[in-house]
Interface confidence: low
């Protein structure tokens, strides 16, 4: 299709070499009542806020994204050619930073319902640059933590070196939805709830004598609880003896609950005690069976191909540990009568 009629938007992504940050492009199709590009009758003005990345209509819930090769080759379908770029409805997610992401990206509705819609498209010219020393060296992280129940703030990485007074007007999005009341370089959160977790996008406009462009940054915000003050507790096994049948295979499961730690390094292992000897057993990898904001339950099994008389004399010990301390639970096997 002819892209000469597409509205054009220029964006700048200055990525930090320090973090594996993400980036997004919204399919900002022009507002119907302000533009001749899109079919006028699709949405009433009331349905469309000033700037809406996800248009609320079913017609626009799915769009087609293309990249325009710099050598003038035909447009390429993003989904086929770029595995590090993921399309989610009206948003294009760039999973890895790099100057090779620079280029022109075009989006348009998949459903073409009228002749007017053919030209309903947006061309986004994306420039990607690594952050230089001249730019702010200690900008806010692209991963930010908010402590549940406390006050906090989310800083726009590309503006965090500027004071609030210097800062230009910022447009914020959370999970693709416009946060219309937020205009400063920092979102202040009076009390943090789990719904504050998500992907935040901050945009502001920069210009020189020739043109203007949007500077965009993406912040992944996670809500966390304070580090646990408790050592892990073993949920299973509860009993210290277990009835078994000789000659039969046996699996003993150790399940332990670990409280949240910002640097999470759980240890869960089995070892065997036999009179004065003890040794760690090679067992299948531990797996997380339940994860919440406050804690995580991890399971690790010990598998005996068949229970022998010798096993009845041994103690099977599950050992779990976090940065606070460790807990053990031993199991003695007893022959079923």
């Amino acid at each position: 299709f002819n892209i000469s009629g597409c509205s054009t938007k220029k964006l700048l992504w200055t990525y930090s070499t320090r973090s594996e940050e993400e980036f997004v492009l919204f399919c900002d199709l022009p507002e119907p009542q302000k533009s001749h590009f899109c079919h006028r009758n699709r949405l009433s003005p009331k349905q469309v806020p000033e700037h809406l990345p996800f248009m609320g209509s079913n017609d626009l819930s799915d769009v087609q994204w293309y990249q325009q090769p710099s050598n003038g080759d035909p447009l390429e379908d993003i989904r086929k050619s770029y595995p590090h770029i993921i399309q989610d409805k009206c948003t294009l997610h760039f999973l890895t930073p790099g100057v090779n992401n620079s280029g022109s990206y075009i989006c348009r509705p998949k459903m073409i319902k009228s002749p007017y819609d053919v030209a309903c498209c947006v061309k986004m010219i994306l420039e990607v640059k690594p952050q230089t020393n001249a730019s702010c060296e200690y900008s806010a992280s692209h991963k930010q933590d908010l402590l549940l129940g406390s006050t906090g703030s989310i800083s726009c990485p590309s503006l965090s070196c500027q004071s609030d007074a210097q800062s230009p007007a910022v447009t914020w999005y959370k999970n693709g939805k416009l946060l219309s009341v937020e205009r400063s370089n920092r979102i202040v959160v009076d009390e943090v709830y789990d719904y504050h977790q998500g992907t935040y996008v901050c945009d502001y406009t920069q210009s020189d004598t020739v043109s203007s462009w949007t500077v965009r940054a993406v912040v992944q915000v996670r809500t966390i609880v304070g580090d646990t003050k408790l050592k892990p507790d073993i949920l299973d096994p509860v009993e210290d003896t277990l009835e078994v049948e000789l000659g039969k295979p046996l699996t003993i499961s150790c399940k332990a609950r670990f409280g949240f730690e910002r640097v999470f390094n759980p240890v869960i292992k089995w070892y065997i005690k036999d009179s004065d000897l003890e040794w760690e057993v090679s067992v299948p990898e531990a797996k997380s069976i339940k994860s919440t904001l406050k804690d995580e339950i991890i399971e690790r099994n010990i598998i005996l191909e068949k229970v022998t008389q010798r096993d009845l004399r041994r103690k099977f010990v599950c050992f779990v540990q976090n940065s606070i301390g460790n807990t053990t639970q031993s199991v003695q096997l007893k022959e079923k009568r």
């Epitope: 320090r18 973090s19 594996e20 940050e21 200690y138 806010a140 992280s141 692209h142 991963k143 930010q144 933590d145 908010l146 402590l147 406390s150 006050t151 906090g152 703030s153 989310i154 800083s155 965090s160 070196c161 920092r186 992944q220 304070g226 580090d227 730690e261 910002r262 640097v263 390094n265 940065s323």
Partner: antibody
Framework: QVQLQQSGPGLVKPSETLSLTCTVS????????WSWIRQPPGKGLEWIGY???????NYNPSLKSRVTISVDTSKNQFSLKLSSVTAADTAVYYC??????????????????WGQGTTVTVSS | AIQLTQSPSSLSASVGDRVTITCRAS??????LAWYQQKPGKAPKLLIY???SLESGVPSRFSGSGSGTDFTLTISSLQPEDFATYYC?????????FGQGTRLEIK
Amino acid sequence: QVQLQQSGPGLVKPSETLSLTCTVSGGSINNYYWSWIRQPPGKGLEWIGYIFYSGTTNYNPSLKSRVTISVDTSKNQFSLKLSSVTAADTAVYYCARDVGIAARNSYYYVMDVWGQGTTVTVSS
Amino acid sequence: AIQLTQSPSSLSASVGDRVTITCRASQGISSALAWYQQKPGKAPKLLIYDASSLESGVPSRFSGSGSGTDFTLTISSLQPEDFATYYCQQFNSYPITFGQGTRLEIK
């Protein structure tokens, strides 16, 4: 850009409490963890503990019984108190920012901004 | 606590030399290791994080490698400003610990 300015006395008497403050300028104290580290003369670095802007702390077990780290978000500063000091606590004390790194699908933390250091001598 | 042992403790080298410093952890720490440079009377400066990622603004002659228990910091061609003490640091589990340091001196 973020800078850390340390303040506090350079001389403390044995058995007294060492108190240092670190003021954050050029950025907010919110959303970050803030650490204290010390370095005895001619020796290596020892991590004392950290505080999150909300007040959550974690201390080195070797010093835990004597250490208190607190934060005052309204003043954009955090502080270290070390009680019952002895000559072994003589060191250069540093404050630092811990920044979260999104590395290999995990969160790691490194100290990317440091204060200028305060030499504290414990002597009567 | 996880112990980090650096070797050598001190090292003499000339401008232009290739230098390697090693750091061994007493238990596996994945890649949660950082390297810092410290000059006399100054605070440490972050060089490498996540074992091999170069901090913004640090010259590319510095590189890090390793995972698990064995890590190395390499300076491909020593410059006069590189003479300093280097520390490794683990952030895999508490308490956070540093190596004892490697002092790099001019030969």
